[in-house]
């Protein structure tokens, strides 16, 4: 057992350019504080829930108020130290959380107004009982600067706080084949006393006689990877040679709620149901109320006044959790048919939708000509979201109101001559040639090729195209 | 386009161990915040979820059935392996698999596709 | 346990009517999951937290609620809805279900 600790020195603009603006005004006082969130492991899949090595949460820091026209400055700090706690092993490897929460104070409707200025996160390698780790994280604009360390808590010493430690029973050495224990150098590592067997790499004890497993590892001794013991099946075949895989522990066994909590299994994690006057991941922070503003993400707090008195808090649509600090990325299944674009604006899901859709989830293919007038004869063709006019000749544009030139394409053959025409082009064609648009010579002997020319009009007259 | 198809023997004598595969794709299980579970019906009854593995080895069981479930992946093949042991009769039942995404960490978002299920008959 | 109780447990109605299929579970839950299943096939996603449609789902359908008491609404039933429906919890161990509500033509 041991406590991770977490101090903040300074939160403030970063360097260069784009300087944020100061969150709080003289119109709008506001005092800052701070989440810490911690999980063991390095990947940032680690199969816990968020904060399984546990979480704090800091004091509220001064009333601060921004002096009018100037740059924000570091922002006053809530005094002392975070502290989280952390019941078995230290890990060796973490991930944290670091967040920057701002509260109003001006007259607010229903309390305190809450909202996070900044959120920092981090992969690191710490040994416990180490010195303290300076770091420095940019979350856009704003820069947060803090130390850190993991110490354990006596007796338990070591880079994990899985030794334990005991005073020196004589003042001058310890007992036979014990060292001393660096760095109390006036006390003794104690006598094993974890059950005889148990892993040194994968076991530890908090009591005498006992073997607890680190994640991952199984058995009396914790000598088993997790699913992979041979076993036999307690109520299958009997056969010495059944191989057989045991479900690894669940993450109840064992409770890992304090303070009388109930544990149940969530579908990738678990879940405290902590007793009155305890909230935290596993129940272990007590004497919380309402006052301390422990709910997240503008969540709705109610609960006595008093430490002994219950508080719930009521999470607004996106958010769950017992402290509404889990996000629900509702968007993520892709709610917005036909390309249309999803927002999750937290009290509901909207979606934008690409021209031609519409509906709560643009399911509805709009009729693109509905309503669409395509001027001077043209007609309405759809697709694709959007409407287009096929124009009648002589006319162009999207809605078939500009007048088209109809010989701007030089649309007669063989050096035919164009002339427009108020129901289309005339091609004027040159000698040896017919057609509407010029295109057929004549042959020698007076027949045209294919087409015959209409009855009534020569071959070198004018041909009118309608 | 994403598919699972299970599959297994269709009768089990009482006392065996019953083993479905589950081969699905469209999806990876090794991608963040996919997983894989299973589901039965006996006929004329209810749906009862039994287990799930996600991505990253993460396994639930039901309550009721841990001591006879073992759920395991194989990424490489697509594929996910349920074992349930010492089968009765009230095992009877048609087992499907179906795919869960978590795009939270501790938040299903849907268990969206599903296979049209195995009918396992359980009688000696 | 998490017990998942529908109401009613079936229902007959005409094409065209309006459908409420309610959910209740006896302890709070964060999001309710509704499935439709028809004679003989697996089951298909309807909605999922609480209140989305899952792709290929009719806009007539709409889920709401929250806590302990979630609703299944279908706003103008097609002879194609007419199959049962399940809901669904997934808060806590074992991740229960809903005996079903069997909607039958009248």
């Known amino acids: 057992a041991g406590v991770f600790e977490l101090q903040i020195h300074s939160f403030g603009p970063g360097p260069g350019p784009g300087a944020p603006r100061s969150p709080c005004s003289a119109r709008l006082p506001c005092r800052l504080f701070f989440r810490v969130c911690l999980k063991p492991g390095l990947s940032e899949e680690a199969a816990e829930s968020p904060c399984a090595l546990g979480a704090a949460l800091s004091a509220r820091g001064p009333v601060y108020t921004e002096q009018p026209g100037a740059p924000a400055p570091d922002l006053p700090l809530p005094d002392g130290l975070l502290q989280v706690p952390f019941r078995d092993a230290w890990p060796g490897t973490f991930s944290f959380i670091i967040e920057t929460w701002r509260e109003e104070l001006g007259d607010q409707i229903g309390g305190p107004a809450w909202s996070l200025l900044a959120r920092v996160a981090g992969r690191r390698r710490l040994a416990a009982g180490g010195p303290w780790a300076r770091d420095i994280q940019r979350a856009g604009a704003w820069e947060l600067r803090f130390s850190y360390r993991a110490r354990c808590e006596p007796p338990a010493v070591g880079t994990a706080c899985t030794r334990l430690c005991r005073p020196r029973s004589a003042p001058s050495r310890c007992g036979p084949g014990l060292r001393p224990c660096a760095p109390l150098e006036d006390e003794c590592e104690a006598p094993l006393v974890c059950r005889a067997g148990c892993s040194p790499e994968h076991g530890f004890c908090e009591q005498p006689g006992e073997c607890r497993c680190l994640e991952g590892w199984t058995g009396p001794l914790c000598t088993v990877p997790v699913s992979t013991s041979s076993c036999l099946s307690p109520r299958g075949p009997s056969s010495a040679t059944t191989g057989c895989l045991v479900p690894g522990p669940g993450p109840c066994d064992g409770n890992p709620c304090a303070n009388g909590g109930s544990c149940s299994e969530t579908p990738r994690s678990f879940e405290c149901t902590c007793p009155r006057g305890f909230y935290g991941l596993r129940c272990e922070v007590s004497g919380v109320t309402c006052a301390d503003g422990p709910c997240f993400n503008g969540g709705l707090c109610v609960g006595g006044a008093d430490p002994d008195s219950a508080y719930i808090c009521h999470c607004p649509p996106g958010f769950q959790g017992s402290n509404c600090e889990k996000r629900v990325d509702r968007c993520s299944l892709q709610p917005c048919r036909n390309g249309g674009l999803c927002l999750d604006l937290g009290h509901a899901l909207r979606c934008r939708c690409r021209a031609g859709f519409a509906g709560p989830r643009c399911e509805h293919d709009l009729d693109d000509c509905a309503g669409r007038a395509c001027a001077n004869g043209g007609t309405c063709v759809e697709g694709g979201g959007a409407h287009r006019c096929s124009c009648a000749l002589g006319f162009g544009g999207r809605d078939c109101r500009e007048r088209a030139d109809p010989c701007a394409a030089r649309p007669c053959a063989h050096g035919g001559r164009c002339y427009a025409h108020f129901s289309g082009l005339v091609c004027a064609c040159a000698p040896g040639y017919m057609g509407a648009r010029c295109e057929f010579p004549v042959h020698p002997d007076g027949a045209s090729a294919l087409p015959a020319a209409p009855p009534g009009l020569r071959p070198g007259d004018p041909q009118r195209y309608l | 386009q994403i598919t699972l198809k299970e599959s297994g023997p269709t009768l089990v004598k009482p006392t065996q161990t019953l083993t479905l595969t589950c081969t699905f794709s469209?999806?990876?299980?090794?991608?963040?915040?996919?997983?894989v579970g299973w589901i039965r019906q006996p006929p004329g009854k209810a749906l009862e979820w039994l287990a799930h593995?996600?991505?990253?080895?993460?396994?639930r069981y039901s309550h009721s059935l841990k001591s006879r479930l073992t759920i395991t992946k194989d990424t490489s093949k697509n594929q996910v392996v349920l074992t349930m042991t010492n089968m009765d009769p009230v095992d009877t039942a048609t087992y499907y698999c179906?795919?869960?995404?978590?795009?939270?960490?501790?938040?299903?978002?849907?268990?969206?596709?599903w296979g049209q299920g195995t009918l396992v008959t359980v009688s000696s | 346990d998490i017990q998942m109780t529908q109401s009613p447990s079936s229902l007959s109605a005409s094409v065209g009517d309006r459908v409420t299929i309610t959910c209740s579970a006896s302890?709070?839950?964060?999001?309710m999951y509704w499935y439709q299943q028809k004679p003989g096939k697996a089951p298909k996603l309807l909605i999922y937290?609480?209140?989305n449609l899952a792709s290929g789902v009719p806009s007539r359908f709409s889920g709401s609620g929250s806590g302990t008491d979630f609703t299944l609404t279908i706003s103008s039933l097609q002879p194609e809805d007419f199959a049962t429906y399940y809901c669904?919890?997934?808060?806590?161990?074992?991740?229960?279900f809903g005996q079903g509500t069997k909607l039958e033509i009248k």
């Open positions: 179906a795919r869960i995404v978590s795009f939270d960490n501790d938040v299903v978002s849907a268990m969206d596709y």
């Open positions: 469209g999806f990876s299980l090794s991608t963040s915040g996919m997983g």
């Open positions: 593995i996600w991505w990253d080895d993460v396994k």
């Open positions: 302890s709070s839950v964060s999001y």
């Open positions: 937290l609480t209140s």
């Open positions: 669904q919890q997934w808060r806590s161990n074992p991740f229960t």
